[in-house]
């Protein structure tokens, strides 16, 4: 606890201090004071630097003395030998003793006091800036008029800061410009301007006079601008150094002055005012500025339009352009937003055919769809190249977007029947052969596929069953073949209206009519052995003349057996209607003159007994179309005969493709349209 | 009408080998597919194999994969399967069948013919 | 190969009974099966092809049905000719397997 005085006496005094003790004492009087140690009576053994017996008088880190002997006073009024006076708070006096004393020494007496210090005048640093003021135990620092005491109580500083300028333009100088700056002052001035402006600032050199840069380069006083995150200075000497125009891109500006105690100069003065914050002209690839101009600035509104084949693609949605506006902070809105080439997606595939996969799907890469050949061919024309266009589609130059049809190639036989050894009449046939051959189980009989959702048969085929299971692709009807083939199913059976139903199917004589259509409840995919045969045209190239030669192929009767195992065929010529008239009817159900002839039959055959029988009824009569020979179409239809093995009649197809072309286009589904 | 006449009854002993034959009449047999069945007394029927024409090859069941071979000599019209490595429960009636048409799986059967395993 | 399995291995039934047996198969076969009767010393007799399809001279007491691995022979009223053992085959794909059999005996 601190004394403001005390007594300090050595060992056993006034008797004969004892031998080797080293003793301190820790003086400690109030803060704001300092300590006068006096001594009254010294007689401690005499050595060259105290070295053997001393007293030590310590403040801080300072030895302020080291004394030993015999002292006696100056004064005859005064008791003092020795005296120490420190402008400090805190003593220590240290007492040390060797091993021997060759005489009798008694030690010290010694008395310390608080005293004043003068805080103003006793230390080389000065602790005010301005005016110090002491008084016992302290001292308090005062300032001149217009100044006041910072709150470290020392400095005194000009109150400077604290301005806020608003208006967008405006004038801000160095305080008693152009007189001397204060010392030792921190002025802060803040510009805040209304957003999207920024704050600029213009200086002439000969306005600007602050005391320079010392030796290292650091300015003792400084003029220093702060926008943001950007600071522009220190600035300090003769002449402003820094550009005499700044654009801060900032509507807030701080000004920091800085002086230090010395050297005070006339200061600075300087204009600002508001500009609008300009937005850079940003290059924007692939795109056209609307309205162009050489400087954009804040409220500017500009449309940006893609060119042809970009598009701006924002979530999901794609547009061709957008708005952007120079926003307060100089930034574009939108400015996330890019032109990018326009990408039609992968294209989409198509029923029979396809379409490699594109090295890319943006604007401009081209695309090609072909068909399963040599089975499918491209109805539609257009040569099935796409390129990606603008707007997004795969776009072929002849259809647009719409895409290329893969329709089934008709009439051609992957390979040509060749006549073996005879069978009635007929050879071993391979399904290749007749790919449009259609094998009915029940009845057992034929049909011609004519395209994927279309069979082509007799009408006293279906008009017992309705409900006919048909199969393609195979030359044995065999159970493990037929397992193995394209089983088709019916959708719905349409019978000519022409045709007259009757309550006893196996008495009929007239065959007039006899043509139907089976619509399949899915398309049949082409191959090989599965292809249509073609239908005839309606010019009078495909009327047929007396021996012109037609194939025939079917499981029907054989001389051999009921029903063939495997697909048997044979060519014959077109005969004229008479032949079939004059044979003799095998096992007629009503009288010879019962029996209908029309114009809707062809009669052929007759030619080495070669015939259909029972069991072929519905397959075509196949003959090579007269404008594409590598084309089959189906002239006839298998209807009824005489006898089996001479001539037989067959539904002339030419004069239904009307209502073939009628019955399929009424009832396709969407796809087919 | 198809008739398929069968070779006649065999004993044989285990580890030798049988061949049973089967002559077609009423038809030729490049026109048919034949099948063998067999039935061990008191059990059930089992389908053995049988010469796709189609395909060119003859199709064994699993089962006899290895011990069975189906032949044809078609200048005499007759089928042949022989049965190797017999064990006593290879006894049975063994079948030749042709194959129908339009989803009948046989259209005539042989007279069988038994073939005892016995040592 | 495929497995045909057969149920029940045994039925006992009265004349004038609805009789129904079930054939399973391992893997679909569509409509591709066949049912056989068999008497004792006798080559197996089709009844049914194609599942539902009655071959010609069998009575209409006999009726198919099923497809994909699910099929059905019904008898809708026993007669003493059909006490029997009945097999289904399918004929899917080479291999043709038969099922066990179903021994059809009188109550």
């Known amino acids: 606890e601190p004394t403001m005085y005390g007594e300090i006496l050595s060992p056993n005094y006034p008797q004969a201090y004892p031998s080797e003790v080293e003793k301190s004492w820790d003086i400690e009087v109030p803060e704001g004071y300092g300590i006068h140690l006096y001594f009254t009576h010294l007689d401690i053994e005499l050595s060259e630097n105290c070295a053997y017996d001393s007293v030590q008088i310590i403040s801080g880190d300072t030895e302020e003395g080291r004394l030993c002997g015999q002292r006696s006073s100056n004064n005859p009024h005064s008791p003092i030998v020795e005296e120490f006076q420190v402008p400090y708070n805190k003593l220590q006096v240290i007492f040390k003793s060797d091993f021997s004393n060759e005489e009798r020494f008694t030690g010290f007496a010694a008395y310390y006091v608080a005293t004043d210090i003068n805080e103003c005048t006793d230390f080389v640093d000065v602790p005010c800036s301005h005016f110090c003021n002491n008084f016992i135990g302290g001292y308090f620092c005062s300032c001149p008029p217009e100044y006041f005491l910072h709150d470290d109580m020392k400095n005194c500083g000009v109150n400077c800061s604290g301005d806020v300028f608003t208006a967008l333009i405006g004038e801000i100088a160095s305080p008693n410009y152009p007189k001397p700056y204060p010392e030792n002052s921190r002025c802060e001035y803040q510009i805040r301007l209304e957003k999207g402006f920024q704050v600029v600032v213009t200086l002439r050199r000969e306005d600007f006079d602050v005391e320079a840069a010392d030796s290292a380069g650091n300015c003792l006083d400084s003029l220093v601008f702060v926008a943001g995150d950007r600071q522009f200075g220190p600035y300090c000497g003769h002449g402003f150094p820094g550009p005499l125009n700044i654009e801060t891109k900032s509507n807030a500006l701080d000004i920091i002055f800085q002086t230090d105690l010395t050297g005070q100069k006339k200061g600075w003065k300087l204009r600002y005012h508001g500009d609008p914050m300009p937005c850079p002209k940003e290059d924007t690839p692939n795109s056209v500025w609307e309205p162009a101009k050489a400087k954009y600035v804040f409220r500017d509104v500009v449309q940006i339009t893609c060119l042809d084949g970009f598009e701006v693609v924002e979530g999901r949605v794609g547009a061709t352009s957008f708005y952007s506006t120079c926003q307060s902070n100089g930034k574009w809105s939108n400015s996330k937003l890019k032109c990018q080439p326009v990408d039609c997606g992968i294209p989409e595939s198509i029923e029979n055919g396809k379409v490699e996969d594109p090295e890319s799907t943006l604007f401009g890469s081209v695309i090609r769809y072909t068909c399963e050949e040599p089975y499918y061919y491209m109805e539609n024309g257009g040569g099935g190249e796409y390129h990606c266009a603008g707007n997004g589609s795969w776009v072929n130059e002849v259809l647009g977007p719409e895409l290329p049809k893969c329709v089934p190639v008709c009439g051609v036989p992957r390979e040509p029947f060749e006549e073996k050894q005879r069978i009635i009449g007929g050879s071993d046939a391979d399904i290749k052969n007749f790919p449009w051959q259609v094998f009915f189980d029940n009845p057992w009989a034929g049909g011609a596929l004519i395209n994927e959702y279309w069979v082509l048969t007799a009408a006293h085929v279906v008009e017992g069953n309705r409900e006919p299971t048909m199969y393609v692709g195979s030359t044995s009807v065999q159970t493990s073949r037929l397992a193995k083939s394209k089983m088709l199913t019916p959708e719905h059976v349409f019978i000519h209206p022409g045709w007259k139903l009757l309550e006893v199917p196996e008495g009929r004589t007239n065959f007039d009519n006899d043509i139907a259509l089976v619509r399949l409840k899915d398309p049949v995919k082409m191959g090989p052995t599965v292809s249509p045969i073609c239908l005839p045209g309606t010019s009078s190239d495909y009327n047929l003349m007396d021996g012109d030669l037609g194939l025939i192929s079917g499981w029907g009767r054989t001389e051999k057996r009921d029903r063939a195992v495997r697909l048997k065929a044979a060519r014959l010529p077109v005969a004229p209607l008479r032949k079939c008239k004059e044979v003799k009817v095998e096992k007629p159900t009503a009288d010879a003159e019962a029996y209908v002839f029309t114009p809707n039959m062809i009669c052929a055959g007759g030619e080495k007994g070669m015939d259909s029988c029972k069991g072929d009824s519905g397959g075509a009569f196949a003959v090579q179309d007269p404008n594409d020979k590598t084309k089959f179409y189906a002239a006839g239809l298998v209807s009824w005969g005489p006898q089996c093995g001479t001539y037989g009649l067959y539904t002339r197809v030419k004069n239904y493709v009307d209502w073939i072309m009628k019955t399929m286009q009424e009832n396709s589904t969407p796809r087919e349209d | 009408e198809v008739q398929l006449v069968q070779s006649g009854a065999e004993v044989k002993k285990p580890g030798a080998s049988v061949k049973v034959s089967c002559k077609v009449s009423?038809?030729?047999?490049?026109?048919?597919?034949m099948h063998w069945v067999r039935q061990a007394p008191g059990k059930g029927l089992e389908w053995m194999g049988t010469?796709?024409?189609?395909?060119?090859?003859?199709i064994y069941a699993q089962k006899f994969q290895g011990r069975v071979t189906m032949t044809e000599d078609t200048s005499t019209d007759t089928a042949y399967m022989e049965l190797s490595y017999l064990r006593s429960e290879d006894t049975a009636v063994y079948y030749c069948?042709?194959?129908?048409?339009?989803?009948?799986?046989?259209?005539?059967w042989g007279q069988g013919t038994l073939v005892t395993v016995s040592s | 190969d495929i497995q045909m399995t057969q149920s029940p291995s045994t039925l006992s039934a009265s004349v004038g009974d609805r009789v129904t047996i079930t054939c399973r198969a391992s893997?679909?076969?569509?409509?591709?099966l066949a049912w056989y009767q068999q008497k004792p010393g006798k080559a197996p007799k089709l009844l049914i092809y194609?599942?539902?399809s009655l071959e010609s001279g069998v009575p209409s007491r006999f009726s198919g049905s099923g497809s994909g691995t699910e099929f059905t022979l019904t008898i809708s009223s026993l007669q003493p000719d059909d006490f029997a053992t009945y097999y289904c085959?399918?004929?899917?794909?080479?291999?043709?397997?038969f099922g066990q059999g179903t021994k059809v005996e009188i109550k």
């Open positions: 069948v042709t194959e129908g048409l339009a989803g009948i799986p046989f259209d005539s």
């Open positions: 009423g038809d030729t047999l490049t026109e048919l597919s």
């Open positions: 010469f796709d024409p189609e395909e060119g090859e003859t």
């Open positions: 893997q679909s076969i569509s409509s591709w």
């Open positions: 194609k599942a539902s």
């Open positions: 085959q399918q004929v899917n794909s080479l291999s043709w397997t």
